[in-house]
C-alpha cells in the first residue's frame, strides 16, 4: 500500500494550526500513530512529540478505499518559545513502518510578527501585528 | 459488556437548545464511531451524524449541518449531541449508537436507551 | 445522498409463514448494507450485517440476502416475537441513511 503524509498550517485570528494529514487505506490504519515534532531533527517519536494521534481504525463508512487522518496543532499565541523546526511523521506499531514529512520552521521576527516557511503547499500570505505569514 | 446509557427526557421550547448525553462503558471508546439517530412518534429512524472520539471528526446529513453539534469526552467516555433552534417538528426520541468496526460489524451493533425531546411552547 | 426504498410499508403475516422483505437503494452499495429490528417502546436491534452476514444471538431464521441495490430480509418461520418494524440502513457513504421501514403484523 501507499501511505503519505502532508504538513499545512492554518490561521484563525492569533491561533495558527499546524496540521499533519496523513492518506492511507482502510486496512492500513491499524496500528498506526501520527505525530508532530519540535527541533527534534533525528529521534522523532511519539514520546519526544508535542502531540500524537492514533489514526481511525474504522473511516466510518464502508464504501471508501483511501481515507484522511488530521492531527491538529494549536498555538493559541504565537511567541518566541514557538520557533523552530517541525516535522510531521508516522510509525506503525505493528509492521514498524516509519514516514517523515518534510521539516516547516517558525520564525519569530523582532517586530512581533512570525513567519511559517516550508509549507510548499500552501500559498503566500501575509499578516500583521503578532498575525504570521504562511509561505 | 457494552453499556451506552443517555441522559433523561427533556421538555424544551421552541427557539431553545437542548444538550443530549450519552455515556460509553465497557469498551475502547476512542475507536468506535458514536452515531446519533432520532426516531419523531410514529415515523421512522432518522441518521443525524456521527463523531469519531479518537480524533473528533464529525460527519452529518444535510439537515442537521449548522444546527446539531456533535462532541465526545474522553475523559469520561461520554458523546453530546447538542441540538439548537428547536421547532415542534424535533419532537423525538433521540438514540446514541455505536457502530462496529468495519468489515468486521459495520451496522450500529449497540445503542442507547434513548431520550424523549418535547418541544412545545 | 443514498435512498433506501422498502417495500412494502406493512406485511400482514400468520405466526408460522415466511416473511420476505426488501430493500431498494438509489445506487449500488455494494453489500453495505445492514437489517434491524424494532419493537414499540425499545431501541433498534442490529439483526443482519453486511446484507447477509448472521450476528451472534439472533435466531437463525433470520437471513439476509442481495447485493448491489436489491436487498432481501427474510424470516423463514414467523414466531410471535417477530412482529414488529424492520429497517435496512447503508454504511456505504455518508451521510449514512435508513429506510423508511417495514411493520410485519399478525395477520
Known amino acids: 500500500g501507499c501511505i503519505n503524509i502532508t504538513s499545512s498550517a492554518s490561521q484563525e485570528g492569533t491561533r495558527l494550526n499546524l496540521i499533519c494529514t496523513v492518506w492511507h487505506k482502510k486496512e492500513e490504519a491499524e496500528g498506526f500513530v501520527v505525530f508532530l515534532c519540535k527541533d527534534r531533527s533525528g529521534d522523532c517519536s511519539p514520546e519526544t512529540s508535542l502531540k500524537q494521534l492514533r489514526l481511525k481504525r474504522d473511516p466510518g463508512i464502508d464504501g471508501v478505499g483511501e481515507i484522511s487522518s488530521q492531527l491538529m496543532f494549536t498555538i493559541s499565541q504565537v511567541t518566541p518559545l514557538h520557533s523552530g523546526t517541525y516535522q510531521c511523521c508516522a510509525r506503525s506499531q505493528k509492521s514498524g513502518i516509519r514516514l517523515q514529512g518534510h521539516f516547516f520552521s517558525i520564525l519569530f521576527t523582532e517586530t512581533g510578527n512570525y513567519t511559517v516557511t516550508g509549507l510548499k503547499q500552501r500559498q503566500h500570505l501575509e499578516f500583521s501585528h503578532n498575525e504570521g505569514t504562511l509561505s | 459488556q457494552v453499556q451506552l446509557v443517555q441522559s433523561g427526557a427533556e421538555v424544551k421550547k421552541p427557539g431553545a437548545s437542548v444538550k443530549v448525553s450519552c455515556k460509553a462503558s465497557g469498551y475502547t471508546f476512542t475507536d468506535y464511531w458514536m452515531q446519533w439517530i432520532r426516531q419523531a412518534p410514529g415515523q421512522g429512524l432518522e441518521w443525524i451524524g456521527a463523531?469519531?472520539?479518537?480524533?473528533?471528526?464529525?460527519q452529518f446529513t444535510q439537515k442537521f449541518r449548522g444546527r446539531a453539534t456533535l462532541t465526545a469526552d474522553k475523559s469520561t467516555s461520554t458523546a453530546y449531541m447538542e441540538l439548537s433552534s428547536l421547532r415542534s417538528e424535533d419532537t423525538a426520541v433521540y438514540y446514541c449508537?455505536?457502530?462496529?468496526?468495519?468489515?468486521?460489524?459495520?451496522?450500529?451493533?449497540?445503542w442507547g436507551q434513548g431520550t424523549t425531546l418535547t418541544v412545545s411552547s | 445522498e443514498i435512498v433506501l426504498t422498502q417495500s412494502p410499508a406493512t406485511l400482514s403475516l400468520s405466526p408460522g409463514e415466511r416473511a420476505t422483505l426488501s430493500c431498494r437503494a438509489s445506487?449500488?452499495?455494494?453489500?453495505?448494507l445492514h437489517w434491524y429490528q424494532q419493537k414499540p417502546g425499545q431501541a433498534p436491534r442490529l439483526l443482519i450485517k453486511?446484507?447477509?452476514q448472521s450476528i451472534s444471538g439472533i435466531p437463525a431464521r433470520f437471513s439476509g440476502s442481495g447485493s448491489g441495490t436489491d436487498f432481501t430480509l427474510t424470516i423463514s418461520s414467523l414466531e410471535p416475537e417477530d412482529f414488529a418494524v424492520y429497517f435496512c440502513?447503508?454504511?456505504?457513504?455518508?451521510?449514512?441513511?435508513f429506510g423508511g421501514g417495514t411493520k410485519v403484523e399478525i395477520k
Open positions: 449508537a455505536r457502530r462496529g468496526i468495519a468489515a468486521v460489524v459495520g451496522g450500529f451493533d449497540y
Open positions: 440502513q447503508q454504511s456505504n457513504s455518508w451521510p449514512l441513511t
Open positions: 463523531i469519531y472520539p479518537g480524533d473528533d471528526d464529525a
Open positions: 445506487q449500488s452499495i455494494s453489500n453495505h
Open positions: 453486511y446484507a447477509s
